[in-house]
């Protein structure tokens, strides 16, 4: 004969566990129904009655099957340096990530707690390492034969143009100037930009910031404060 299906609440067999989407209520000593995401337990089960669930109120949520008495509060509104990549619903918390040009200097389980502007490399310096969602830009001095004449968190050092006759030699912060109307060939037709990091919902990813406005607070976590940008504007 087929085993009889037990309906909640029911007493589990000795040594067995409750089924999926059920929990063992210590008081009733019964297997009872969990509430679905977006709901919470309004009334706990007894030996004769199952869990009574109710929808989460506005600005609260439950993401998992649960038997919590109250839904969790959604996080506060995203700050001005952040974008809301996931709205607060009855089934999910709000997620804030850093807006383009910023990176996450202090992450939390989901999203970002503190965004900071990506460092800008000053003229004579280019981006050695682009900003990521979780790390700042790193700059480097432009090597001989290359230059950057911008203050930017994305521009790399570009080769000097090649002249038939050089009027003014290029340096780290200026392109060469040719005497003829057009150079033999220009190796650097325009500013080369690095792609901005994309804000994703991946666990520890961060966008990009600009340094001069970065908060000055040092967060003494297990290890310290935040990052510098090569050849920054503040030198």
């Amino acid at each position: 004969l087929p085993a009889q299906v037990a309906f909640t609440p029911y007493a589990p067999e000795p040594g067995s566990t409750c089924r999926l989407r059920e929990y063992y209520d210590q008081t009733a000593q019964m297997c009872c129904s969990k509430c679905s995401p977006g709901q919470h337990a309004k009334v706990f089960c007894t030996k004769t009655s199952d869990t009574v669930c109710d929808s989460c109120e506005d600005s609260t949520y439950t993401q998992l099957w649960n038997w919590v008495p109250e839904c969790l509060s959604c996080g506060s509104r995203c700050s001005s340096d952040q974008v809301e990549t996931q709205a607060c619903t009855r089934e999910q918390n709000r997620i804030c990530t850093c807006r383009p040009g910023w990176y996450c200097a202090l992450s939390k389980q989901e999203g970002c707690r503190l965004c900071a502007p990506l460092r800008k490399c000053r003229p004579g310096f280019g981006v050695a390492r682009p900003g990521t969602e979780t790390s700042d830009v790193v700059c480097k001095p432009c090597a001989p034969g290359t230059f950057s004449n911008t203050t930017s968190s994305t521009d790399i050092c570009r080769p000097h143009q090649i002249c038939n006759v050089v009027a003014i030699p290029g340096n780290a912060s200026m392109d060469a100037v040719c005497t003829s109307t057009s150079p033999t060939r220009s190796m650097a037709p325009g500013a080369v930009h690095l792609p901005q990091p994309v804000s994703t919902r991946s666990q520890h990813t961060q966008p990009t910031p600009e340094p001069s406005t970065a908060p000055s607070t040092s967060f003494l976590l297990p290890m310290g404060p935040s990052p510098p940008a090569e050849g920054s504007t503040g030198d």
């Epitope: 200097a105 900071a116 050695a128 790193v138 666990q203 990813t205 967060f219 310290g224 510098p228």
Partner: antibody, heavy 121, light 111 residues
Framework: EVQLQQSGTVLARPGASVKMSCKTS????????MHWVKQRPGQGLEWIGT????????SYNQKFKGKAKLTAVTSASTAYMELNSLTNEDSAVFYC??????????????WGQGTTLTVSS | DIVMTQSPASLAVSLGQRATISCKAS??????????LNWYQQKPGQPPKLLIY???NLPSGIPARFSGSGSGTDFTLNIHPVEEEDAATYYC?????????FGGGTKLEIK
């Protein structure tokens, strides 16, 4: 607990290539720059370069371009450094180290135990 | 590249006294009011260990007898009072731009 475990001592011939590894655990591998540092016997520390495992971006010390190649396998949370055209000058201890880029500072907070490379004919 | 110059190359300090190590950068390692200068301690057969970051900040677990100061191009590491276990080589390192560069090291001996 953050850990960086490097491969063991290597003995190689001049002209050969070697590849050493740095296996990480205890943190999100794709979220931190991994650096490599060289230390010749009785000498100071020399920065080789760095890789960001999240997208494989690299930045090298000009001196080591063409000498060192940095790679990472995210599924194994392991960084690698390959050194080619070996000479006696490449005999050294090589460290992998994680760079922490927190708000308003960058620093190497965790280091591997080092891989000793001896180049000898 | 930023050249980091440490002095002295070695020093011997009596137990309980003060050890002072200097580090000079060939150009400023400051950005937006912060100094990107770190100090590491290395003992024979061991990897370097972070001692001070951002010129003056102590990571957790580092004794308060270690302190760092300075900005721009001139930085100082102080150890007071010096203990036996502080015998090691100390390196400064700038993290303001690539390539990252280290000082030549200062070997501290305890008398």
């Amino acid at each position: 607990e953050v850990q960086l475990q490097q491969s063991g001592t290597v003995l190689a011939r001049p002209g050969a290539s070697v590849k050493m590894s740095c296996k990480t655990s205890g943190y999100t591998f794709t979220s931190y720059w991994m650096h490599w540092v060289k230390q010749r016997p009785g000498q100071g520390l020399e920065w080789i370069g760095t890789i960001y495992p999240g997208n494989s971006d690299t930045s090298y010390n000009q001196k080591f371009k063409g000498k060192a190649k940095l790679t990472a396998v995210t599924s194994a949370s392991t960084a690698y450094m390959e050194l080619n055209s070996l000479t006696n000058e490449d005999s050294a201890v090589f460290y992998c180290t994680r760079e922490n880029l927190l708000l308003r500072s960058y620093f190497f907070d965790y280091w591997g135990q080092g891989t000793t490379l001896t180049v000898s004919s | 590249d930023i050249v980091m110059t440490q002095s002295p190359a070695s020093l011997a300090v009596s137990l309980g006294q003060r050890a002072t190590i200097s580090c000079k950068a060939s150009q400023s390692v400051d950005y937006d009011g912060d100094s990107y200068l770190n100090w590491y301690q290395q003992k024979p057969g061991q990897p370097p260990k972070l001692l001070i970051y951002a010129a003056s900040n102590l990571p957790s677990g580092i004794p308060a007898r270690f302190s760092g100061s300075g900005s721009g191009t001139d930085f100082t590491l102080n150890i007071h009072p010096v203990e036996e276990e502080d015998a090691a080589t100390y390196y400064c390192q700038q993290s303001n731009e690539d390539p990252r560069t280290f000082g030549g090291g200062t070997k501290l001996e305890i008398k």
